[in-house]
C-alpha cells in the first residue's frame, strides 16, 4: 500500500486558448484531471487502474501552483493504492477549462480540454521527487511526482507491512526496509524474547523482561550460577542441585555430623588433650588432677585414695588428712605398729620381719596388693575394653564385659545377640526383642552370669570389741583386725595394753 504523489508547479497558457485553438472567455479557468494506470507501451484511453484525481480551478491561463500540503490543501495530489507497487506506471494529465462552477465531466462541453499529456516509465519507491516538464504547441506544464509507502508499509514495493509495537506480541520499531528493529533489551524474530541480565546463566536462568535473571529450580544467585544444596545441608556444598558434598571434618547426609569436634568446639578444659572419636564424638585425656567428660572438674586430693591400710581421707583447706585405723600411723597410714606375730597379711600373703621385728612386709599372692595384701589387684586401670565394654577383675586376670552387639577378649568384635555366646559360666542365652537374657547356673549371677556368688564371711559380724573384719577371698574366711587391748581370732580376749609409743 502506498501513494503516488503528483505536485503541479506551473502551467503556462499564454494565449489562453483551448486545445481546439479557440480562446477561453474571458480567460481559461484551469483545473486538472489526473489518471494513473498500469504501464502501457502506448498510453491509451481506458480505465485508470491505479486511480484518478481532479483538482479545483487552480488559476487562469498561466499560473504557478501553490504547495498546499502543509495547509491541508490538494497539492501535491494524492493517488493512493493498496497493492504492491509494480515499479512502472502510465500517467495522463489533462488541463480543462471550467466555464462555470460544475466541474463534472458530463457538465463540461467536449471542447473544454486545454491540453493533455501522457507519460509512462519506471518509478521506484522513494522520497525524492522526479521533476518533469511537458510542452505542447500552446501550453507547458511543469510538475514533479514520486511514490511513497503508506504508514506501516515498507520496502521497494511498499509490500512489507510493519507496525511498531511494545506489547506481549513484540517490542520493536520498523526499519526503512520494513525489517523489525528491536527495542533495547529485546531480541528474537519478532522481538518477543527479553535479553536477560548480562551474565545470566544460559541454562539455569531465564527472564520475562529485560535485565532480569530468574533462576530455574535448583539454582540461585544473581546470575543463577550457584546450585542450591540439599535442603538441610549444614556444612556442605554442591556442584549440581540438591547435592550435599561435605566440607572437611563433617559427615552424614546433611553434613551435620561433626567428625572434627575437637577443632570446631575445643571442648577439653584444663589443658586436656582432645581426640576425635567419630561423628560428633570426642575423648578428652585429662591432665593429672582433673576428671569429667571435658576434664572440667578437679579431683579432690582424697580422690586419689592416698590413705593406706584402711585409713580414711578427709579434705582440708590446705590439702588432706588421713585418719588411720588402729595399728597404723604416718602421713598416709603407711607405718604399722603390728609385727608378723599379729598375722597382718591377708588373702594368703606371707609375712617377712623387718628392722629386728619392729616392722614387717607382706608378700602378696598375684591377685592382691597393698601393704597388708588387703586390696584386690585392679587390672582395669588401663581401660582395655573397647566399644564401651566394662572391665572386671577376675582373680589374677581381668575380663571385659561387653555391651550388646560386641564380643572378643576386649569387646573389639561386633556380633549380634546370642551368636557371640555372651553368657558366662555356662549360662543359657535367650534372644529377646531388644537384646538378650542369660539364665545363670547355680553359683553365678549378673546380667551375663559373670558374678561368682561367694559367701561374705564378714556378713555375720564375727569380730568382737569393734574389731575390723576382712574377708579372705582365697578361702572365703574372715580375719579380725583387733583394736588396742584385745587379742584372739575374733578379738574376744582382753589383754594389757602395749607400752605407749613416742609418736
Amino acid at each position: 500500500s502506498g501513494v503516488f504523489q503528483l505536485q503541479l508547479q506551473e502551467f503556462i497558457n499564454e494565449r489562453g486558448v483551448l486545445a481546439s485553438g479557440r480562446p477561453c472567455e474571458p480567460g481559461c479557468r484551469t483545473f486538472f484531471r489526473v489518471c494513473l494506470k498500469h504501464f502501457q507501451a502506448v498510453v491509451s484511453p481506458g480505465p485508470c487502474t491505479f486511480g484518478t484525481v481532479s483538482t479545483p480551478v487552480l488559476g487562469t491561463n498561466s499560473f504557478a501552483v501553490r504547495d498546499d500540503s502543509s495547509g491541508g490543501g490538494r497539492n501535491p495530489l494524492q493517488l493512493p493504492f493498496n497493492f504492491t507497487w509494480p515499479g512502472t506506471f502510465s500517467l495522463i494529465i489533462e488541463a480543462w477549462h471550467a466555464p462555470g462552477d460544475d466541474l463534472r465531466p458530463e457538465a463540461l462541453p467536449p471542447d473544454a480540454l486545454i491540453s493533455k499529456i501522457a507519460i509512462q516509465g519506471s518509478l521506484a519507491v522513494g522520497q525524492n521527487w522526479l521533476l518533469d516538464e511537458q510542452t505542447s504547441t500552446l501550453t507547458r506544464l511543469r510538475y514533479s511526482y514520486r511514490v511513497i509507502c503508506s504508514d506501516n508499509y515498507y520496502g521497494d514495493n511498499c509490500s512489507r507491512l510493519c507496525k511498531k509495537r511494545n506489547d506481549h506480541f513484540g517490542h520493536y520499531v520498523c526499519q526503512p526496509d520494513g525489517n523489525l528493529s528491536c527495542l533495547p533489551g529485546w531480541t528474537g524474530e519478532y522481538c518477543q524474547q527479553p535479553i536477560c541480565l548480562s551474565g545470566c546463566h544460559e541454562q539455569n536462568g531465564y527472564c520475562s523482561k529485560p535485565a532480569e535473571c530468574l533462576c530455574r529450580p535448583g539454582w540461585q544467585g544473581r546470575l543463577c550460577n550457584e546450585c542450591i544444596p540439599h535442603n538441610g545441608c549444614r556444612h556442605g556444598t554442591c556442584s549440581t542441585p540438591w547435592q550435599c558434598t561435605c566440607d572437611e571434618g563433617w559427615g552424614g547426609l546433611f553434613c551435620d555430623q561433626d567428625l572434627n569436634y575437637c577443632t570446631h568446639h575445643s571442648p577439653c578444659k584444663n589443658g586436656a588433650t582432645c581426640s576425635n572419636s567419630g561423628q560428633r564424638s570426642y575423648t578428652c585425656t585429662c591432665r593429672p588432677g582433673y576428671t569429667g567428660v571435658d576434664c572440667e572438674l578437679e579431683l579432690s586430693e582424697c580422690d586419689s585414695n592416698p590413705c593406706r591400710n584402711g585409713g580414711s581421707c578427709k579434705d582440708q583447706e590446705d590439702g588432706y588428712h588421713c585418719l588411720c585405723p588402729p595399728g597404723y600411723y604416718g602421713l598416709h597410714c603407711e607405718h604399722s605398729t603390728l609385727s608378723c606375730a599379729d598375722s597382718p597379711c591377708f588373702n594368703g600373703g606371707s609375712c617377712r620381719e623387718r628392722n629386728q621385728g619392729a616392722n614387717y612386709a607382706c608378700e602378696c599372692p598375684p591377685n592382691f596388693t597393698g601393704s597388708n595384701c588387703e586390696k584386690k589387684v585392679d587390672r582395669c586401670t588401663s581401660n582395655p575394653c573397647a566399644n564401651g565394654g566394662q572391665c572386671l577383675n577376675r582373680g589374677p586376670s581381668r575380663m571385659c564385659r561387653c555391651r550388646p552387639g560386641f564380643t572378643g577378649t576386649y569387646c573389639e568384635l561386633h556380633v549380634s545377640d546370642c551368636a557371640r555366646n555372651p553368657c558366662a559360666h555356662g549360662g543359657t542365652c535367650h534372644d529377646l526383642e531388644n537384646g538378650l537374657m542369660c539364665t545363670c547356673p547355680a553359683g553365678f549371677s549378673g546380667r551375663r552370669c559373670e558374678v561368682r556368688t561367694s559367701i561374705d564371711a564378714c556378713a555375720s559380724s564375727p569380730c568382737f570389741n569393734r574389731a575390723t573384719c576382712y574377708t579372705d577371698l582365697s578361702t572365703d574366711t574372715f580375719v579380725c583386725n583387733c583394736p588396742y587391748g584385745f587379742v584372739g581370732s575374733r578379738c574376744e580376749f582382753p589383754v594389757g595394753l602395749p607400752p605407749s609409743f613416742p609418736w
Epitope: 571442648p267 564424638s281 570426642y282 575423648t283 571435658d294 572438674l297 583447706e317
Partner: antibody
Framework: QVQLQESGPGLVKPSQTLSLTCTVS??????????WSWIRQHPGKGLEWFGY???????YYNPSLKSRITISVDTSKNHFSLRLSSMTAADTAVYYC????????????WGQGTLVTVSS | ETTLTQSPGTLSLSPGERATLSCRAS???????LAWYQQKPGQAPRLLIY???SRATGIPDRLSGSGSGTDFTLTISRLEPEDCAVYYC?????????FGQGTKVEIK
C-alpha cells in the same frame, strides 16, 4: 525458653531399677555444649548430684553412685534418661533433671521434679 | 568429696533487714566455681548466683554473692516477704559436684 519435664513411675519396688526420662522443649539436647544432669533431693534434705550426659554421648557419674547409674540421651526424641539400679527405701526422693551451661556446672534450667517412692 | 557447710541453719529476720548467709568449703574452690540457689516449697531450685558473684538473669540487685577460696557469702540487702525460702550453695569445681545442706530464711 528452655523447659525440662521429668517423667517416670512414682512408685518402685525394692531391688528394681528406676527409669526416668527428661524431655526438653524450647531447645535441643543435641545443640550447644551443655551438660544434661540428674539431681535428687531426699524428703526435707539437701541436694545430691548423680552425673551428666553431653550431646556427644559422653557421660560422667558421681563416683559414690557410679556402679548403679546409667544416663543416656536420645536426640531424635529430644530427651535424656536416668537408670538407677538396686533401688532401696533410701532412694525415695524427688528426682530433678537440670541443664548446666558450657564448661561450668551451675544449673540454669531445672525440671519441676518427680517424686519417686521405693516401697514393696 | 568437697563438703559445703552452710550457716546458720535457720535465719529469722524482719522485712527490710539484711540477711547474710555463709557457705564454707572443706577445700579451696578454684576459679570461684560456686553457685547459690533459692528453693521454695514444692518447687525446683532456682539459680541466683554463679561464679561466686555473678547474678543470674532476672535476679534483683538486692541479692549479691561474694567470697573466694573456702568462704563464700550470699547477701540479701533488704529482706522482702517473697525471699522466704531455703538457700543452697553448690560447688562445681571438684568432682563430685556437691551442695550445702541449706539455710532456711524466715520472715518474723
Amino acid at each position: 525458653q528452655v523447659q525440662l519435664q521429668e517423667s517416670g513411675p512414682g512408685l518402685v519396688k525394692p531391688s528394681q531399677t528406676l527409669s526416668l526420662t527428661c524431655t526438653v522443649s524450647g531447645g535441643s539436647v543435641s545443640s550447644g555444649n551443655y551438660y544434661w544432669s540428674w539431681i535428687r533431693q531426699h524428703p526435707g534434705k539437701g541436694l545430691e548430684w548423680f552425673g551428666y550426659i553431653k550431646n556427644s554421648g559422653g557421660t560422667y557419674y558421681n563416683p559414690s553412685l557410679k556402679s548403679r547409674i546409667t544416663i543416656s540421651v536420645d536426640t531424635s526424641k529430644n530427651h535424656f534418661s536416668l537408670r538407677l539400679s538396686s533401688m532401696t527405701a533410701a532412694d525415695t526422693a524427688v528426682y530433678y533433671c537440670a541443664r548446666a551451661g558450657s564448661g561450668s556446672h551451675y544449673f540454669d534450667y531445672w525440671g519441676q521434679g518427680t517424686l519417686v517412692t521405693v516401697s514393696s | 568429696e568437697t563438703t559445703l557447710t552452710q550457716s546458720p541453719g535457720t535465719l529469722s529476720l524482719s522485712p527490710g533487714e539484711r540477711a547474710t548467709l555463709s557457705c564454707r568449703a572443706s577445700q579451696s574452690v578454684s576459679s570461684s566455681y560456686l553457685a547459690w540457689y533459692q528453693q521454695k516449697p514444692g518447687q525446683a531450685p532456682r539459680l541466683l548466683i554463679y561464679g561466686a558473684s555473678s547474678r543470674a538473669t532476672g535476679i534483683p540487685d538486692r541479692l549479691s554473692g561474694s567470697g573466694s577460696g573456702t568462704d563464700f557469702t550470699l547477701t540479701i540487702s533488704r529482706l522482702e516477704p517473697e525471699d522466704c525460702a531455703v538457700y543452697y550453695c553448690q560447688q562445681y569445681g571438684y568432682s563430685p559436684i556437691t551442695f550445702g545442706q541449706g539455710t532456711k530464711v524466715e520472715i518474723k
